[in-house]
């Protein structure tokens, strides 16, 4: 895993500028792990970052991700139930200027360096469909979630609400 000290030194100012016209309602650093307690790690390889899902050695430090949470208004004409609703959206940044992106064409999750305003591919609708676990749904592709496939993160299509609890799209956030 690459040195995350840069993330630890994130200043408040870094994310004070507005993203897609809004500022995050809250931000914090957390490690990301799967439902089965494998860690999500990030490694610099050939000048680009790779994302891995792996078991860490006993004293190995977990990589941290800066999660920025945004409130998104969902108008009633889209919601289908006659009421305006709010959703939580999140962006995930494991190191300065890099964000997780949904590549819907390749069904992959990638780390891209980008400037603000961040593209829609960097935003994920937050679900907590299972006790103390979260899921990340692509803003750009409803019904498609970040999931685990072959020890990597991938985009996984969820075709019914019963499948929202499949373990491979459930993640745990930990601040320790």
């Amino acid at each position: 895993a690459f040195g995350i000290s840069g993330v630890q030194k994130y200043t408040r100012a870094l994310h004070d500028s507005s993203i897609t016209g809004i500022s995050p309602i809250t931000e914090y650093l957390a490690s990301l792990s799967t439902y089965n307690d494998q860690s999500i790690t990030f490694a610099l390889e050939d000048e680009s970052y790779e994302i891995y899902v792996e078991d860490l050695k006993k004293d190995e430090k977990k990589d941290k991700v800066l999660l920025s949470y945004y409130e998104s208004q969902h108008p009633s004409n889209e919601s289908g139930d006659g009421v305006d609703g709010k959703m939580l959206m999140v962006t995930l940044s494991p190191t300065k200027d890099f964000w997780l992106h949904a590549n819907n064409k390749e069904h992959s999750v990638e780390l891209h360096k980008c400037e603000k305003p961040l593209p829609d591919q960097a935003f994920f609708v937050l679900h907590n469909m299972h006790s103390n676990c979260v899921s990340f749904e692509c803003k750009t592709d409803p019904g498609v979630f970040i999931g685990v496939k072959d020890n990597h993160l991938a985009l996984i299509k969820v075709d019914s609400s019963e499948n929202l609890c499949t373990e491979n799209i459930l993640f745990k956030l930990s601040e320790t």
Epitope: T26, Y28, D81, L88, M129, N132, E162
Partner: antibody, heavy 121, light 107 residues
Framework: QVQLQESGPGLVKPSETLSLTCTVS????????VHWIRQPPGKGLEWIGV???????SYNSALMSRVTISVDTSKNQFSLKLSSVTAADTAVYYC???????????????WGQGTLVTVSS | DIQMTQSPSSLSASVGDRVTITCLAS??????LAWYQQKPGKSPKLLIY???RLADGVPSRFSGSGSGTDFTLTISSLQPEDFATYYC?????????FGQGTKVEIK
């Protein structure tokens, strides 16, 4: 427009099962999590459990062995059953809806008016 | 389970006073904290969510602050309709536990 309404018997005998229903309108149970909370007379609030937007259910471990939450989406209703009740289960029982779609992180924005259930023989 | 400890359990104040209620979580809950107001015989009403966000229709004299384990609800200038009991609640982990409540009474 958003409404939640609890209903059920106000008196339950010890050792029997308490059964309550919450009827909702103005929103979809497929988008919002809904919760049961109770409050004994003169005391604080206790979270009982949640029916999440995806259909999964989580319970308070302190009550888990006795509690069941279920849903009838066709009637826009979800229900609470609490078995083997004692006088300590006497409380006002509330149903409530999440503030956010798909997530409970924003607290409970809408509440029913509550229904008092007394456990007594 | 995460324990939520509110203080004080009760307080007496006058109209126009600045009132502060604190809530301490037994472990970090990021900013996933809500504050509710409850009047006798009524359902709780959401005041603040995500520690600092004012719920719809709530007067701006109410504000919330804090993150991690320490949180505060402030009423900048107490009004007659603010005399009630206030509860904090963590939404970081199930079970979603509440503080024991703070009763704000008229001095």
């Amino acid at each position: 427009q958003v409404q939640l309404q609890e209903s059920g018997p106000g008196l339950v005998k010890p050792s029997e099962t308490l059964s309550l229903t919450c009827t909702v309108s103005g929103f979809s149970l497929s988008k919002y999590g809904v919760h049961w909370i109770r409050q004994p007379p003169g005391k604080g609030l206790e979270w009982i459990g949640v029916l999440r937007a995806g259909g999964t259910i989580s319970y308070n471990s302190a009550l888990m062995s006795r509690v069941t939450i279920s849903v009838d989406t066709s009637k826009n209703q979800f229900s609470l059953k609490l078995s083997s009740v004692t006088a300590a289960d006497t409380a006002v029982y509330y149903c409530a809806r999440d503030h956010y779609y798909y997530s409970s992180f924003g607290g409970f924005a809408s509440w029913g008016q509550g229904t008092l259930v007394t456990v007594s023989s | 389970d995460i324990q939520m400890t509110q203080s004080p359990s009760s307080l007496s104040a006058s109209v126009g006073d600045r009132v502060t209620i604190t809530c301490l979580a037994s472990q970090t809950i990021a900013t996933w904290l809500a504050w509710y107001q409850q009047k006798p015989g009524k359902s709780p009403k959401l005041l603040i969510y995500a520690a600092t966000r004012l719920a719809d229709g709530v007067p701006s004299r109410f504000s919330g602050s804090g993150s991690g384990t320490d949180f505060t609800l402030t009423i900048s200038s107490l009004q007659p309709e603010d005399f009630a009991t206030y509860y904090c609640q963590q939404l970081y982990n199930t079970p979603y536990t509440f503080g024991q409540g703070t009763k704000v009474e008229i001095k």
